[in-house]
């Protein structure tokens, strides 16, 4: 049975040209995290593999930095970066946990972080 929950940074906003940290945290499970995938809609941004370390997708290398921790830093933001981001925790023996973050990139200086919130755990089905 999957008992874990993922806490994410939730709905966040940031200024065009700035940076933002995407963070997820898996708790309430003793499952071993074998890999974390970061995805934006239909594209892999980065992978952190427990054995092999961090690897940034070639098409995002200039704008994505690993960390802090299992999080991801997006740099040089554009309005096209607005949208859904997913942290996908591959674990053993539980399976897959998915967290969702919505990022809005704003033109002006009104950007501010949304409140942290918890989303229920679920298996990642497609």
């Amino acid at each position: 049975m999957m008992t874990g929950t993922i806490e994410t940074t939730g709905n966040i906003s940031a200024e065009k040209g700035g940076s933002i940290i995407l963070q997820c945290h898996l708790s309430s499970t003793t499952a071993q995290v074998t890999q974390v995938n970061w995805e934006q809609q239909d594209q892999l941004l980065a992978i952190c593999n427990a054995d092999l370390g961090w690897h940034i997708s070639p098409s995002f290398k200039d704008r994505v930095a690993p960390g802090p921790g299992l999080g991801l830093t997006l740099q040089s933001l554009t309005v096209n970066d607005t949208g859904e981001y997913f942290c996908i925790y591959h674990t053993y023996p539980d399976g897959t946990y998915t967290g969702r973050i919505f990022l809005e990139v704003l033109e002006s200086s009104v950007a501010e972080h949304g409140a942290r919130f918890q989303i229920p755990h679920h298996h990642h089905h497609h």
Epitope: T34, Q35, N37, E39, D42, Q43, L44, I47, N49, D51, L52, G53, H55, S57, P58, S59, H90, H124, H126
Partner: antibody
């Protein structure tokens, strides 16, 4: 230019072990993964495992755990794959490849292993 | 493990034809798919990575599309030198499994 030079063909007896080498040149050895791939005669490509030469971290396909052991020597920019308890099922061409996790961009020429009594 | 299925083991085509090879993942792999060309007696060559990005120096007649579970590799105008086996491979999670391969035969 980037090159991966593999050791030569091997003819070995069942039950023995063999160590295949893959010498890298033309790039920073510790900045890329080294992946290993098996191809049996008339068959497709099968991923064996991968090593991060910088950290020494390894990851294997389950069926090759206990069969293959991946190591890397940073001082000589050489990766190794040791195969143990050899049987006829291990007769194949083995490739090493430079990996960026998301793809394998340079490949060795392949090492043919024949296991026969 | 993620299973990558290439439904056609063989495909027959003529020079100048357009040909598409399909690959289906057993579960979501985002765009974490690469395509390789393997000619007899040679090492495999990378053609496409991240489902749709053409690797450096690869002719533009080779293209890739897809995301999620369904992927397609297309040669827009087949040349005689394209005779080879083509493999998809997923890089979404280890083990980095290959498809069974599709052998392109020239009529």
């Amino acid at each position: 230019q980037v090159q991966l030079q593999q050791s030569g063909a091997e003819l070995v007896r069942p039950g023995t072990s063999v160590k295949v080498s893959c010498k890298a040149s033309g790039y920073a050895f510790t900045n890329y993964l080294i992946e290993w791939v098996k191809q049996r005669p008339g068959q497709g490509l099968e991923w064996i495992g991968v090593i991060n030469p910088g950290s020494g971290g390894t990851n294997y396909k389950e069926k090759f755990k206990g069969k293959a052991t991946l190591t890397a020597d940073k001082s000589s920019s050489t990766a190794y794959m040791q195969l143990s308890s050899l049987t006829s099922e291990d007769s194949a061409v083995y490739f090493c490849a430079r990996g960026e996790y998301f793809f394998f961009d340079y490949w060795g020429q392949g090492t043919t292993l024949t296991v026969s009594s | 493990d993620i299973v990558m299925t290439q439904s056609h083991k063989f495909m027959s085509t003529s020079v100048g034809d357009r040909v598409s090879i399909t690959c289906k993942a057993s579960q979501h792999v985002s765009n974490g798919v690469a395509w390789y060309q393997h000619k007899p007696g040679q090492s495999p060559k990378l053609l496409i990575y991240s489902a749709s990005y053409r690797y450096t120096g690869v002719p533009d007649r080779f293209t890739g599309t897809g995301s999620g579970t369904d992927f397609t590799f297309t040669i827009s105008s087949v040349q005689a030198e394209d005779l080879a086996v083509y493999y998809c491979q997923q890089h979404y999670n280890t083990p980095h499994t290959f498809g069974g391969g599709t052998k392109l035969e020239i009529k």
